[in-house]
Every structure is written in C-alpha cells, then in structure tokens.
C-alpha cells in the first residue's frame, strides 16, 4: 500500500495535512493554511492514549467497589485506569468490568492453579495416590499417607477424597 497524502502523525482535512494531537490532548480546532492544529490537555479523570483528532477525551474507567473492583493502576491523561478485583475475587472478562468469587475445588479435586485478580481457580481431579477431602480455593491434592514409612500397613484404601487409613501390622503369635 503506497503512503497516503499526509505523513504519520498527520491527518488530511480540507485539502491540507494537519498535525494530530499527541496522547493526552484533544483537538480544539483543525489547522488552516495559516494556523497550526490547536490541541488542549485532557481534564482530570480523562485520557486519550493515541495520536488523535478526537474532540472529546475518554473518561477514565471507574472501578466500582460494589462490583468487587478496585484500582490496580491509576489512569493518567494518556492511559486509562486499570481495575482489578478484591482479594478472593477475579474479573469476569478481559476488560474487568465486574468480579466473581474465586471457585473452590470440590473434594476429589485439587487446585492446579491458584486464582488471580484476572483468572479463576483451575482445579484438577486428584490422581491415584492423591486426595482432597475439602472444598478449597487453595488446597492442592495431597499424597496418600505412606503407611510403610511409618512401619504401618494399609487398613483402609485411600480414594480421591480420603486418605488411606494405616494400622499396626498383625503380630505373629
């Protein structure tokens, strides 16, 4: 694609190339043959993050605590506010417009990956030799107790939800 009539960081208006406004500023008036483009800084709680010809700045995102949100990074005139979720909650979308409680892994499942502000808990079924007997957002699958290392024997087999039960070895009379 060949270059357009106006260079990068310029725009074409009424048969002339005008300078775009830099990030953090909005367009007040287009350039003319005799005047430069007029730009003004965005106001408090506003931003524009690109070279632009916008006549209005965008409002910073509001991190609504009623939706479980809090400010992760305060916005500037050139960047939007970044929201994240309160402890124990995570975003429902990439835009992080609302939060939901972290999922707990049911008994028989352990935490493969602990939730973050932007991702939910990832659970995995406890494989043979491991168990989880609680509903938790933090607990991994635990290995069954090794009876042998305690000089004990398995009295009751373990499952994905229960540990083995060890007991004393039968003594020969």
């Amino acid at each position: 694609e060949p270059p357009t009539a106006c260079r990068e960081k310029q725009y074409l208006i009424n048969s002339q190339c005008c300078s775009l406004c830099q990030p953090g500023q909005k367009l007040v008036s287009d350039c003319t043959e005799f005047t430069e483009t007029e730009c003004l800084p965005c106001g408090e709680s506003e931003f524009l993050d690109t070279w632009n010809r916008e006549t209005h700045c965008h409002q910073h995102k509001y991190c609504d605590p009623n939706l479980g949100l809090r400010v992760q990074q305060k916005g500037t005139s050139e960047t939007d506010t970044i929201c994240t979720c309160e402890e124990g909650w995570h975003c429902t979308s990439e835009a992080c417009e609302s939060c939901v409680l972290h999922r707990s892994c049911s008994p028989g499942f352990g935490v493969k990956q602990i939730a973050t502000g932007v991702s939910d808990t990832i659970c995995e079924p406890c494989p043979v030799g491991f168990f989880s007997n609680v509903s938790s957002a933090f607990e991994k699958c635990h290995p069954w107790t090794s009876c042998e290392t305690k000089d004990l024997v398995v009295q009751q087999a373990g499952t994905n939800k229960t540990d083995v039960v060890c007991g004393p070895q039968d003594r020969l009379r």
Partner: antibody, heavy 116, light 107 residues
C-alpha cells in the same frame, strides 16, 4: 502570484491512456497538496485524488483506484495525472488545484476527449 | 460518500439584489465547507473556505454561514461579474465531494 498551468487538450482512443501535466509556480511546490478533479460536459465536479508533492503520498477516489496514477516531479514543480483504460465516459475537462483550506488555486483545465 | 445537494439549481436575480444559495450535506461536515465560482473560459475560483473564511482577493459582498449539514452562500448585492455557476464542496471526509452547482443568472 500562484499559477497552475496545465498541458493542452488531448484526443484519445478508448483503451488508451492520457497523462495531464500541471506546472506550479509562485509558491513552494512541496508545501501544499495538489488535488485533481474532473468535469464531464454539462456536469458537476468529481474528485479524482490528491498527492503530496513533498514525498509522493497519495489518496485516490475509490472510483479511480487502479486507473488513475498521480505523480509529482519536485525538480520541475510539476504534478501529473495519468488515467488508463480510457472509455467514452472519461471525456471531461481535467483540473489540478492547489490545496490549503480548500482548493485554493485552480489550473485552467485540460479537455480530454475519448473517441474512436 | 457524503452527498452534497445544492438548491436551487438556477437562481434568477436582478443586479444589486441579494442572492442566497444553499448547500446541504448528507452528514455533519464540521464546517469544512468551501464555495467556488465557475465562469466559462476562466479558471475556477475559491470564494470561501471552512464555511465563512473569505479567500484572498474575494470581495466582501460574498459571505458564508452554516453548521452541521446546512450551509449558505450569500452575495449581498449582485454585480454583473457575479453571474456564474457556484459549487459547494465538503473537505471533511474522503472522497471530497461537490454539489451539482447553482447557476446564478440575470433576471
């Protein structure tokens, strides 16, 4: 004073090409865009495209994309408009104009007649 | 593309009278509206740019106004040399487009 002097009238056969020139004087050639417009007999004005003589960047009307080619020669302060695959409907007066808050100054026009 | 509609197609006026020409855009063109005069055998002339800015050398009897989609060219007192065809043109959005013209003739 600003002047745009265009090349003379042309008669062309359908399917051929025409190249119209526009020599600028009286201002800094690379400081302003050059616009191209045409006017069919008894009709209104139709925009063809615009070129930045400073570095050759162009914008075309979609209607003329692929058929119109705008170029500029800084050494002679001359802009060119070439139109290919001519048909009878391309019979018109072709104008160049200097930009800067509208089409500020116009050439006298070049009549291109397409006839077999 | 933005469609420009001029009215009337022909305007019959006596010398010394006021002439009012209208131009309507199919969408908001943010005051990027220019007016041109065309006379047979002469180069087209820019009269007014950006709705109301008089081009250099153009007499003050020509004035422009309007906003959004509605624009007006007014010639306060027509002189003999003003009988011509007038075109409006929007410079807001590519492709640039022109009205079909208003012919101002002697009544």
């Amino acid at each position: 004073q600003v002047q745009l002097v265009q090349s003379g009238a042309e008669v062309k056969k359908p399917g051929s090409s025409v190249k119209v020139s526009c020599k600028a004087s009286g201002y800094g050639f690379t400081n302003y865009l050059i616009e191209w417009v045409r006017q069919a007999p008894g009709q209104g004005l139709e925009w063809i495209g615009v070129i930045n003589p400073g570095y050759g960047g162009v914008n075309y009307n979609e209607k003329f994309k692929g058929r119109a080619t705008l170029t500029a020669d800084k050494s002679t302060s001359t802009a060119y408009m070439e139109l290919s695959s001519l048909r009878s409907e391309d019979t018109a007066v072709y104008f160049c104009a200097r930009g800067g808050s509208g089409f500020a100054f116009w050439g006298q026009g070049t009549l291109v007649t397409v006839s077999s | 593309e933005i469609v420009m509609t001029q009215s009337p197609a022909t305007l019959s006026v006596s010398p010394g009278e006021r002439a009012t020409l209208s131009c309507r855009a199919s969408q908001d063109i943010s005051n990027h509206l220019n007016w041109y005069q065309q006379k047979p055998g002469q180069a087209v002339r820019l009269l007014i740019s950006s709705t109301s800015r008089l081009h250099s050398g153009i007499p003050a009897r020509f004035s422009g106004s309007g906003s959004g989609t509605e624009y007006t060219l007014t010639i306060s007192s027509l002189q003999s040399e003003d009988f011509a065809v007038y075109f409006c043109q929007q410079g807001n959005t590519l492709p640039w487009t022109f009205g079909q013209g208003t012919k101002v003739e002697i009544k």
